[in-house]
């Protein structure tokens, strides 16, 4: 059985944003390599990242097949240069990940304000509908396609000359808000899935202000 000492992976952690999903773990390998397997609760195990010296593995291609499924991964440790030299008749060391349900747990990426348009005392603010790596009929779905009405956006807006913020919400990607004529406003948006218990909110988008390039103004 040799005298090579392998150690099991630990601190297995899912890092996922807008369904781009990477499994990370420790330790940095010394004289060992790793292979990852992923499975749904009821499905078969699929191997990824064969005999790698990395401590991360991109599992996006697997989880986007069904983002509402619950996944489990495990990381195997093998002696470098001799992956047959493991434990009892080749049984390797391995560690199981926490369970991961992409639809419920993937972080919402920072949204972007695509445009805003002022028509008199109303401003239409449009949030960019970010493309994900989830496919349907060979096309990539947007965040709205995947989450539907589960996803809302909160708009924070305020006069450039003051700090008092107002909020608006939408379950589309557009806001129509009332503004004071002649005033410049600044905007920031946040993606929210109210039904979630974890990772409910994204970080705020970069602030966009009227009088800058993104806006379009039409005085009526």
């Amino acid at each position: 059985s040799g005298t090579t000492n392998t150690v099991a992976a630990y601190n297995l952690t899912w890092k996922s944003t807008n369904f781009k999903t990477i499994l990370e773990w420790e330790p940095k390998p010394v004289n060992q390599v790793y292979t990852v397997q992923i499975s749904t609760k009821s499905g078969d195990w699929k191997s990824k990242c064969f005999y790698t010296t990395d401590t991360e593995c991109d599992l996006t291609d697997e989880i986007v097949k069904d983002v509402k499924q619950t996944y489990l991964a495990r990381v195997f440790s093998y002696p470098a240069g001799n992956v047959e030299s493991t434990g009892s008749a080749g049984e390797p060391l391995y560690e199981n990940s926490p369970e991961f349900t992409p639809y419920l747990e993937t972080n919402l990426g920072q949204p972007t304000i695509q445009s805003f348009e002022q028509v008199g005392t109303k401003v239409n603010v449009t949030v960019e509908d970010e493309r994900t790596l989830v496919r349907r009929n060979n096309t990539f779905l947007s965040l709205r396609d995947v989450f539907g009405k589960d996803l809302i956006y909160t708009l924070y807006y305020w006069k450039s000359s003051s700090s008092g913020k107002k909020t608006a919400k939408t379950n589309t990607n557009e806001f129509l808000i009332d503004v004071d004529k002649g005033e410049n406003y600044c905007f920031s948006v946040q993606a929210v899935i109210p039904s979630r218990t974890v990772n409910r909110k994204s970080t705020d988008s970069p602030v966009e202000c009227m009088g800058q390039e993104k806006g379009e103004f039409r005085e009526i």
Epitope: G2, T3, N5, L72, S88, E91
Partner: antibody
Amino acid sequence: QVQLVESGGGVVQPGRSLRLSCVASGFTVSNDGMHWVRQAPGKGLEWVALIWYDGVNKNYADSVKGRFTISRDKSKNTLYLQMNSLRAEDTAVYYCARRPGTFYGLDVWGQGTTVTVSS
Amino acid sequence: EIVLTQSPGTLSLSPGERATLSCRASQSVSSSYLAWYQQKPGQAPRLLIYGASSRATGIPDRFSGSGSGTDFTLTISRLEPEDFAVYYCQQYGSSLTFGGGTKVEIK
């Protein structure tokens, strides 16, 4: 809490069969390597069989190879040992035990079930 | 098959004394694959040490393991009344095998 409970032991005649069961609670048998270990009266521990985490690979002690079969049922979270062509020397307390993936050792054991092979 | 030979067969000691148990392998064993168990009459074995020197969860620090290659040792620094039992070493190499056991009895 994490627990294993064996059943199915009893008195059986030589040449007959018996199936032992081991029900797990607090963890999933299909995520870990699972073993059967036996102990003849007044003797030491003897490893019997192993089913890997993958449920496909199986290993057996030479003394039981071809007669015993280890298996598991994911839906019942249960480990089995099918024992055929039993012999007097198979008389023992049979324990099921778990090997977690992270190290080479059996960290959870059942209380044991007694098999007596006698005519 | 790797054969594990434990010595002594029986160790007679008093509470508070130090116990040193030996396990010798017929060929080199990776320390990752060496474990120690305690068994009391009528009970299942209990994992004490894995990886030759790592204590299992809930095991008091008076138990320690050491060794490499073919020679491994379990040490109980100060025997408590509940430590009197049979101790087995086990290797997880090409096939899993146990040593014959060492009985630690009250002198």
